[in-house]
């Protein structure tokens, strides 16, 4: 006899990483039958949502009108059918941003470069933190941490046309607290014409994005969007 | 696209039962939502009279509860209202509508029913 | 019973117009209020639920609020297809209550 129900599927809309006093809705997907949604924050409840009839809602909406540094940390949701309680879902790392500083990303040899040749981010900040976050745009969500007291190193390697795109990079004040990104660097890697045509095209961000760093989620991308936040927020941990 | 019809006696005489079915075409009422009964009285007062679930399950308005049933026939795909011991306070258009939000509901177009003495 | 109460019964507003209909309940509903839409000859349809959620496919131009015992619709620019009655229905308590409904005519 089943125990506990499949467990629900958690994410943030627009986006995982949110500007300070800005806004997000937290979602929580479970099951239509479900009489109780839990939120729950840092361990401890933090929101409850009981649909009744005539509703049919297999996907509950917790609303942050105002994101701070005390709204920043790990989510999780479980809900309930009859009785029976559900597995918890995964964690949801949220994130503040745009806290205190704008780090300044640079990248060595330069922003072109052939491919094969080994590329260097640098990410500096010179506020108090010792951790570094480089972000490439795109769902598949390249993230890289770095630690130095007021530069981080982010060696690439030798580069194929698959690490072309624009990269960002944060300071991170704690897991949760991250500063302004940076000015984006653009790193245009050629290669001959074998390579370029097979190298994996990096499904990336509406261009005006990053102003704000939110991903626009229309309902049929929202697990698609969900699966970029998880693979950085694997990351995190 | 979901469809809704009520059909039943246009007529009914002061103490006998009202019968009304409930026609559902696009959709299974065993699948999801609500499958309910509301009526508009004369002067467009609205009142909800009960429901089916898509499990079966009841949920009447208590001031009916002695007197009202519906039911289902899954293999037909409708639901119908039972209301015994009617009063000329039944008078009113009978609408059967599924309601399961956020989906946009689905009414039928309404029955009008007349109890006289 | 709940009972809610609906205001006004009647009214006129301009095209391109703001309207707002209120509807207060006996008590504290939790914010389990859903608006429907009556246009003439039809059957009501619902524009919201939970108090502010639009229903899947309902004009943006419908935004509902409130909590505990208030609650308001509004239409935030009034076009012709909107005339018709709107009601407010609360689902907190069995037995499921409408209000008596606002009679909305273009003037």
């Known amino acids: 006899q089943q125990q506990t129900l499949p467990k629900p599927f958690i994410w943030a809309e627009p986006h995982f990483m949110v500007p300070k006093e800005k806004q997000v809705t937290i979602c929580c997907q479970g099951n239509y039958g479900a009489v109780e949604y839990q939120l729950h924050f840092e361990g401890s409840l933090f929101a409850v949502d009981r649909p009744k009839p005539p509703e049919r809602i297999n996907k509950v909406q917790f609303y942050i009108p105002d994101m701070n540094s005390r709204m920043a940390g790990q989510y999780s949701c479980i809900y309930r059918v009859g009785e029976l309680w559900s597995e918890p879902s995964n964690l949801l790392d949220l994130v503040v941003t745009e806290m205190y500083d704008t780090p300044t990303l640079s990248v060595h040899p330069g922003p072109e470069v052939i491919s094969g040749e080994k590329v260097t981010f640098y990410c500096r900040l010179d506020t108090a933190t010792s951790m570094f976050l480089l972000l490439k745009e795109g769902r598949s969500s390249h993230v890289q941490r770095g630690y130095g007291k007021v530069q981080a190193e982010f060696p690439l390697g030798p580069v194929t046309t698959a690490h072309r795109g624009t990269y960002r990079c944060f300071g991170s004040y704690n897991n949760h607290a991250w500063s302004f990104p940076s000015e984006p660097v653009k790193l245009l890697v050629t290669g001959d014409i074998e390579n370029t045509s097979l190298a994996p095209e990096d499904p990336t961000f509406p261009a005006d994005t990053w102003g704000t760093y939110l991903l626009t989620t229309e309902t049929g991308l929202q697990k698609d969007h969900a699966l970029w936040d998880h693979t950085a927020q694997n990351l995190l941990r | 696209d979901v469809q809704l019809q009520e059909s039943g006696p246009g007529l009914v005489k002061t103490s006998q039962s009202l019968s009304l079915t409930c026609s559902v075409t696009?959709?299974?009422?065993?699948?999801?939502?609500?499958w309910n009964w509301i009526r508009q009285f004369p002067g467009n007062k609205l009142e909800w009279v009960g429901y089916?679930?898509?499990?079966?399950?009841?949920n009447y308005n208590p001031s009916l509860k002695n007197r009202i049933s519906i039911t289902r026939d899954t293999s037909k795909n409708q639901f119908f209202l039972k209301l015994n011991s009617v009063t000329t306070e039944d008078t009113a258009t009978y609408y059967c509508?599924?309601?399961?939000?956020?989906?946009?509901?689905?009414w039928g177009q309404g029955t009008s029913v007349t109890v006289s003495s | 019973d709940i009972k809610m109460t609906q205001s006004p019964s009647s009214m006129y507003a301009s095209l391109g117009e703001r309207v707002t209909i209120t509807c207060k309940a006996s008590?504290?509903?939790?914010?389990?209020l859903s608006w429907f839409q009556q246009k003439p000859g039809k059957s009501p349809k619902t524009l919201i639920y939970?108090?502010?959620r639009l229903v899947d496919g309902v004009p943006s131009r419908f935004s509902g609020s409130g909590s505990g015992q208030d609650y308001s619709l509004t239409i935030s620019s009034l076009e012709f297809e909107d005339l018709g009655i709107y009601y407010c229905?609360?689902?907190?308590?069995?037995?499921?209550?409408f209000g008596g409904g606002t009679k909305l005519e273009i003037k």
């Open positions: 089916i679930s898509y499990d079966g399950s009841n």
């Open positions: 939970r108090a502010n």
């Open positions: 008590q504290d509903i939790n914010s389990y």
């Open positions: 696009g959709y299974s009422i065993t699948s999801d939502d609500y």
């Open positions: 509508a599924r309601l399961g939000y956020p989906a946009m509901d689905s």
């Open positions: 229905l609360q689902y907190d308590e069995f037995p499921w209550t």
